[in-house]
Interface confidence: low
């Protein structure tokens, strides 16, 4: 007789989740010599231990601590790029500007990027049918708690000038409910971080407005200033040209504003 299984509102665990995590770990540790000491089987065991046999609406940051410890990594604290609602461009940028890092350029972020996972209370099974949705079901689900934990730690790690890429095409360029707005902004350490510099990425070809004057950017500035961190903002009017100029800064067309 098939067991009754909780139906959640979100998609289920990504197909071949254990194999994907393990394969990503092996690939990452091969590419990054400083992480060659990492035992990927132990990483998977710690990852699994965070959510297997636990109610998927009752996950805590403590559940992920063994994984956090195993995934400890050295990233230059003054080379951190945060992003909100514009992941692809942020990742394209760090692929070119190799000395800057998004969370997904770290081992833990790389392992979990674009994956979904959850288990079931009191069974060792992974739930491939459905997982809790953050809004419709619960916020303390395995995926949300994971990203909250690693995002908090990543923000805590930052120092000097921290950059954030924001999507200028959205109605809320800065969204207080995003991971950046709800976690990262509040965990930058004022004694270490001098400035948060926002890069507002324009979508339209003919859009020459100063999106740094947008009310939500002013709201971000206010939050940051109250935390004794300086704020600066730049419009990236042509993201395609921006990336091109990061690749080839000597190009004569790159001396004008991008």
């Amino acid at each position: 007789v098939p067991r009754w299984r909780q139906q959640w509102s979100g998609p289920g665990t990504t197909k071949r989740f254990p194999e994907t995590v393990l394969a990503r770990c092996v690939k990452y540790t091969e590419i990054h010599p400083e992480m060659r000491h990492v035992d990927c089987q132990s990483v998977w065991d710690a990852f699994k231990g965070a959510f297997i046999s636990k109610h998927p609406c009752n996950i805590t940051e403590e559940d992920y601590q063994p994984l956090m410890k195993l995934g400890t990594q050295t990233v230059p604290c003054n080379k951190i790029l945060l992003w909100s609602r514009i992941k692809d461009l942020a990742h394209q940028f760090t692929q070119v500007q190799r000395d800057m890092f998004t969370l997904e350029d770290t081992l833990l972020g790389y392992l979990a990027d674009d994956l979904t996972w959850c288990g079931e209370f009191n069974t060792s099974k992974i739930n491939y049918q459905s997982c809790p949705d953050w809004r419709k079901d619960c916020s303390n689900n395995p995926v949300s708690v994971f990203w909250k934990t690693v995002s908090r730690r990543f923000a805590e790690a930052a120092c000097d000038v921290v950059h954030v890429m924001l999507n200028g095409s959205r109605s809320k360029i800065f969204d207080k409910n995003s991971t950046f707005g709800s976690v990262e902004v509040h965990n930058l350490q004022p004694e270490k971080v001098q400035t948060l510099e926002a890069w507002v990425i324009h979508g339209g070809r003919e859009d020459s407005r100063d999106l740094c004057q947008d009310p939500t950017i002013k709201e971000l500035e206010s939050i940051i200033s109250k935390r004794n961190i300086q704020f600066s903002c730049k419009n990236i009017y042509r993201p395609d040209k921006f990336l091109q100029c990061v690749k080839n800064p000597e190009d004569s067309s790159c001396t004008s504003e991008i």
Epitope: T72, T74, V75, C77, T106, R153, E156, A157, Q189
Partner: antibody, heavy 123, light 107 residues
Framework: QVQLVQSGAEVKKPGSSVKVSCKAS????????IGWVRQAPGQGLEWMGR????????HYAQKFQGRVTITADESTSTAYMELSSLRSEDTAVYYC????????????????WGQGTLVTVSS | EIVMTQSPATLSVSPGERATLSCRAS??????LAWYQQKPGQAPRLLIY???TRATGIPARFSGSGSGTEFTLTISSLQSEDFAVYYC?????????FGQGTKVEIK
């Protein structure tokens, strides 16, 4: 303002060990890295290793691997550097220094230094 | 490990003059370079980090430049308290390494 206060000068016999302490006062300790650097008389500066207390994670320069142990006690905000199998060439001033270290990254530049501890190795 | 080479070993300068110290890395260290000043009997003092950013409380006469493998520390107008030994240090790759130092002495 954070200050790093080191233990006093030591005179040691060859083959013995020395343990130098470095206490942080006036600020947080755990969220930083503590690095150890030595300077032989009339010579330049040489990295030995570093620890991030919150992780209890130490890294050592190859030259000192196996001979140096760096530890930290968060409850007393004190870091320790123990060097074993001492020889006359280990006669030097040993400095601890604070770097910005936290979870994901290694410390980098060092903004606050202890006053130094002279260790003399002589038979 | 990355070898840091400083030149000259000794620089003789008169007070009020400009001093230019060089530091070369055996491979690229990006901008992950710091400069320290050390006076006899004292611990090193951080002057510059990130190759060009002055540390808190450091006078504007100290400036750093360069990236990759070639770096320069410039003291625009030497004061009596600036006569000391200066070290560069890379923190791009572990083990971090110092240059052998440049002694700035009174001419």
């Amino acid at each position: 303002q954070v200050q790093l206060v080191q233990s006093g000068a030591e005179v040691k016999k060859p083959g013995s060990s020395v343990k130098v302490s470095c206490k942080a006062s006036g600020g947080s300790f755990s969220n930083y890295a503590i690095g150890w650097v030595r300077q032989a008389p009339g010579q330049g500066l040489e990295w030995m290793g570093r620890i991030i207390p919150v992780l209890d994670a130490a890294h050592y320069a190859q030259k000192f691997q196996g001979r140096v142990t760096i530890t930290a006690d968060e409850s007393t905000s004190t870091a320790y550097m123990e060097l074993s199998s001492l020889r006359s060439e280990d006669t030097a001033v040993y400095y601890c220094a604070r770097g910005l270290g936290y979870y994901l990254y290694s410390s980098y530049y060092f903004d606050i230094w202890g006053q130094g501890t002279l260790v003399t190795v002589s038979s | 490990e990355i070898v840091m080479t400083q030149s000259p070993a000794t620089l003789s300068v008169s007070p009020g003059e400009r001093a230019t110290l060089s530091c070369r890395a055996s491979q690229s260290v990006s901008s992950n370079l710091a400069w320290y000043q050390q006076k006899p009997g004292q611990a090193p003092r951080l002057l510059i980090y990130g190759a060009s950013t002055r540390a808190t409380g450091i006078p504007a006469r100290f400036s750093g430049s360069g990236s990759g493998t070639e770096f320069t520390l410039t003291i625009s107008s030497l004061q009596s308290e600036d006569f000391a030994v200066y070290y560069c240090q890379q923190y791009n790759n572990w083990p971090w390494t110092f240059g052998q130092g440049t002694k700035v002495e009174i001419k």
